[in-house]
């Protein structure tokens, strides 16, 4: 079950809930946003203060890391299994250092299996964080410091830090280095969403959340 099911079962308060893998008894803890846009959102990524190191291995990105109450990555395997069961939407919420907020909403999102390197698939972009997708289209394979699947002769994950669906290296990386205010410009290895803030701006906060399309 996901946060949408938790919501429908009557739990309408934001917080950490125990979710289960589809067709399994395996459990995972996730933060559920039960207020934004009608609730039922499963938070799959959050950056807010630089407290967690996002330069992690393939296995760590697979199973997840961090703390669901703060900065964390839910885990590619859970997200892949979940998003292949039914149609999901992905909402990415962004904050800059000047008090502005923006979002990108994809009407269809899923990750391929690990055998296909958790390739990201996205359709139907709307929102205020750019008219062009800052996640390269068509989607790329996921890359980490020990799993180089990008389209660059270089190793984007090693160079820019963090696991992401790098292209060569692509217009985004929400898992890059966290830079504090006044150190967040001209940083090509920061938390980047190109079609909102440009090539060298490192964001203050990001949240990636998913919910069934028919919620």
């Amino acid at each position: 079950r996901d946060c949408a099911e938790v919501f429908k079962s009557g739990h309408t308060t934001n917080g950490i809930y125990t979710l289960t893998f589809p067709n399994s008894t395996e459990e995972i803890k996730a933060y559920c946003d039960m207020e934004a846009g009608g609730g039922g959102w499963t938070i799959i990524q959050r950056r807010e203060d630089g407290s967690v190191d996002f330069q992690r291995t393939w296995k760590e990105y697979k199973v997840g890391f961090g703390n669901p109450s703060g900065e964390y990555w839910l885990g590619n395997e859970f997200v892949s299994q979940l998003t292949n069961q039914q149609r999901y939407v992905l909402k990415i919420h962004l904050k800059d250092w000047e008090g502005n907020e923006a979002y990108s909403l994809y009407e269809h999102f899923y990750l391929s299996s690990e055998e296909l390197n958790y390739r990201i698939h996205l359709k139907g972009l709307t929102g205020t964080a750019g008219k062009i997708s800052s996640i390269s289209q068509p989607g790329n394979d996921f890359s980490t410091k020990d799993g180089d699947n990008d389209k660059c002769i270089c190793k984007c994950s090693q160079m820019l830090t963090g696991g992401w669906w790098f292209d060569a290296c692509g217009p985004s990386n929400l898992n890059g280095m966290y830079y504090p205010q006044r150190q967040n410009t001209n940083k090509f290895n920061g938390i980047k969403w190109y079609y909102w803030k440009g090539s060298g701006y490192s964001l203050k906060a990001t949240t990636m959340m998913i919910r069934p399309a028919d919620f």
Epitope: A168, C169, F188
Partner: antibody, heavy 122, light 107 residues
Framework: EVQLLESGGGLVQPGGSLRLSCAAS????????MSWVRQAPGKGLEWVSV????????YYADSVKGRFTISRDNSKNTLYLQLNSLRAEDTAVYYC???????????????WGQGTLVTVSS | DIQMTQSPSSVSASVGDRVTITCRAS??????LAWYQQKPGKAPKLLIY???SLQSGVPSRFSGSGSGTDFTLTISTLQPEDFATYYC?????????FGGGTKVEIK
């Protein structure tokens, strides 16, 4: 095989203009930032300009700012450099350069053209 | 602008020698440095990027190290085809600047 073929160099008088072109092949041109680097005769390398994948971001060395303009046409796989108000000190071999990545704020050149010579003299 | 200072400006060496070239940045550039090789009349060739990452197809006798302001390019066993001029370049901030070059000559 990556190929970058420059053209448009030549002899021009001080104050004159030239347009350099660079035809790219062997890679997905629209996915990479592109640069121009120059080298005066017998001297070292000097970075001139870089352009983002979409062409929306351009940056220049102070020595050419306001006089040179970098642009690209992704439909033609071609990079350009418009040189105006040329000076004697602009005399150099101009190299078209493919960046390693698409990150315009971090230029590493992994492929270079053969260079085209621009001579500014009266 | 960040100044890049290479030393020595030239070095005479024999085939089989170990050659070390240094590059110093006028301010901290983290690990955002490249090394290029250039032969007379030819375009430069990327050897190393991000201070120590070996570019695809470059022989493993070339290695790079350093971070911050001090960087080194090492050729472990000099080969006849390695006689050339070597340049460092900072990729940390605009404008991107090159060192003055180090010419590796036959002793």
């Amino acid at each position: 095989e990556v190929q970058l073929l420059e053209s448009g160099g030549g002899l021009v008088q001080p104050g004159g203009s030239l347009r350099l072109s660079c035809a790219a092949s062997g890679f997905t041109f629209r996915k990479y930032a592109m640069s121009w680097v120059r080298q005066a005769p017998g001297k070292g390398l000097e970075w001139v300009s870089v352009i983002s994948v979409s062409g929306g971001n351009t940056y220049y060395a102070d020595s050419v700012k306001g006089r040179f303009t970098i642009s690209r046409d992704n439909s033609k796989n071609t990079l350009y450099l418009q040189l105006n108000s040329l000076r004697a000190e602009d005399t150099a071999v101009y190299y078209c350069a493919k960046d390693l990545t698409d990150i315009v704020l971090m230029v590493y050149v992994d492929y270079w053209g053969q260079g085209t010579l621009v001579t500014v003299s009266s | 602008d960040i100044q890049m200072t290479q030393s020595p400006s030239s070095v005479s060496a024999s085939v089989g020698d170990r050659v070390t070239i240094t590059c110093r940045a006028s301010q901290d550039i983290d690990r955002w440095l490249a090394w290029y090789q250039q032969k007379p009349g030819k375009a430069p060739k990327l050897l190393i990027y991000a201070a120590s990452s070996l570019q695809s197809g470059v022989p493993s006798r070339f290695s790079g190290s350093g971070s911050g302001t001090d960087f080194t390019l090492t050729i472990s066993t000099l080969q006849p085809e390695d006689f050339a001029t070597y340049y460092c370049q900072q990729a940390n901030s605009l404008p991107f600047t090159f060192g003055g070059g180090t010419k590796v000559e036959i002793k």
